[in-house]
Interface confidence: low
């Protein structure tokens, strides 16, 4: 059917397929040191790794893409590893009137899939 | 700010950056010929192309990813081109009792961004 079960075991070996990783970044790395006050460092969860055939397919489109990539690799790219959900993060930043806390809903990944 | 405007003109030249492209596929290509009756071929819109720095960033996470990729290309992958929205598609398929029409909401891409 169109909704074949996405495969969840990595055929490429441990840690090679699409998964969540933590990357350390400072405000300077992000170019935010002039407006974000805190935290001074962020542990940013990101989606990395390869998307072999049907691994963690996001949806029907991703399954089709995987299949057509196998047939026409020059025309159709393989699915790639992107966030499926996010974790809210609070940043304290400067405002004209002082400082404020603001929640960013789309800053740190919480889960990954192949799209 | 965290919400810098995503860049919308492609610095790599026409057609090189993340965009929607139509790929023609038959039911045989998709492995669906045994259960889908119609249409016999599909014009599948897919997202293809590169995601240079800040091009069509999906959200704050994608902007961060682009920046950190520039700083640590071995550790952090570049954003990649994936669907931002989908177009519903109706397929006629076989059932135990005959045929039925079913709408698939996540089969054909309608828009693309870099995530």
């Amino acid at each position: 059917s169109a909704h074949a079960h996405p495969r969840d075991s990595c055929p490429l070996g441990p840690g090679r397929c699409c998964h969540l990783e933590t990357v350390q970044a400072t405000l300077e790395d992000l170019g935010w040191s002039d407006w974000v006050l805190s935290p001074r460092q962020l542990q940013l969860s990101m989606c990395v790794g390869e998307c072999p055939h049907l691994y963690r397919s996001a949806n029907t489109h991703a399954q089709i893409k995987a299949r057509l990539h196998g047939l026409q690799p020059d025309k159709v790219p393989a699915p790639c590893c992107v966030p499926s959900s996010y974790t809210p993060v609070v940043l304290m930043h400067r405002t004209d009137s002082g400082v404020s806390l603001q929640t960013y809903d789309d800053l740190v990944a919480r889960g990954c899939h192949c799209a | 700010s965290a919400h810098a405007h995503p860049r919308d003109s492609c610095p790599l030249g026409p057609g090189r950056c993340c965009h929607l492209e139509t790929v023609q596929a038959t039911l045989e290509d998709l492995g669906w010929s045994d259960w889908v009756l119609s249409p016999r071929q599909l014009q599948l819109s897919m997202c293809v192309g590169e995601c240079p720095h800040l091009y069509r960033s999906a959200n704050t996470h994608a902007q961060i990813k682009a920046r950190l990729h520039g700083l640590q290309p071995d550790k952090v992958p570049a954003p990649c081109c994936v669907p931002s929205s989908y177009t519903p598609v109706v397929l006629m398929h076989r059932t135990d009792s005959g045929v039925s029409l079913q709408t698939y909401d996540d089969l054909v891409a309608r828009g693309c961004h870099c995530a």
């Epitope: 990783e21 933590t22 001074r40 542990q43 | 550790k75």
Partner: antibody, heavy 119, light 107 residues
Framework: QVQLVQSGAEVKKPGASVKVSCKAS????????INWVRQAPGQGLEWMGW????????NYAQKLQGRVTMTTDTSTSTAYMELRSLRSDDTAVYYC????????????WGQGTMVTVSS | DIQLTQSPSSVSASVGDRVTITCRAS??????LAWYQQKPGKAPKLLIY???SLQSGVPSRFSGSGSGTDFTLTISSLQPEDFATYYC?????????FGGGTKVEIK
Amino acid sequence: QVQLVQSGAEVKKPGASVKVSCKASGYTFTSYGINWVRQAPGQGLEWMGWITAYSGDTNYAQKLQGRVTMTTDTSTSTAYMELRSLRSDDTAVYYCARGPGQYADVDVWGQGTMVTVSS
Amino acid sequence: DIQLTQSPSSVSASVGDRVTITCRASQGISPWLAWYQQKPGKAPKLLIYAASSLQSGVPSRFSGSGSGTDFTLTISSLQPEDFATYYCQQANSFPITFGGGTKVEIK
């Protein structure tokens, strides 16, 4: 369940080195960092440093810089902390702890490894 | 480095008492502060993260509050199992630092 299991107690002479291991289970090892924290007898908690299991990025406490090395082996989901040129004031319980998360809070701790430095 | 000063260093209290522990940072860290409980011979246990968020599985008698440089851990009704040492920890920047600890003893 999420667990961090540390290697056993060690007795070392001044000037020697010690390497403590910390084996993780019950979660995706590379999705988190590992903190190392020590506690001298009757004293408070002292943060030693942090390593991200994915990339091997480290950040060490200034006072231990040059004497401490933190590493991970992703194939066995194990973190290691090596401390060189041991002194008597390095006698402590050494803890590994999962984190930091976004807020650097440490939610899961190992059981601790007692390292005694004595001549 | 950010210094954390905890007070009091020890407190004697009875079961059912309300206990308040404060933690003052040498510079603003809001809301990147956590609280831990440690019992003798055991590893610390996370109680509160991000200044006021209760860690899963921790009883609701524990609460955290505060912002900027001043933070508070409150135990609303002390239970026998709460006699322990409590530490605050800042997570705003490396090096991560802990407060000196507050020992909660039986009166």
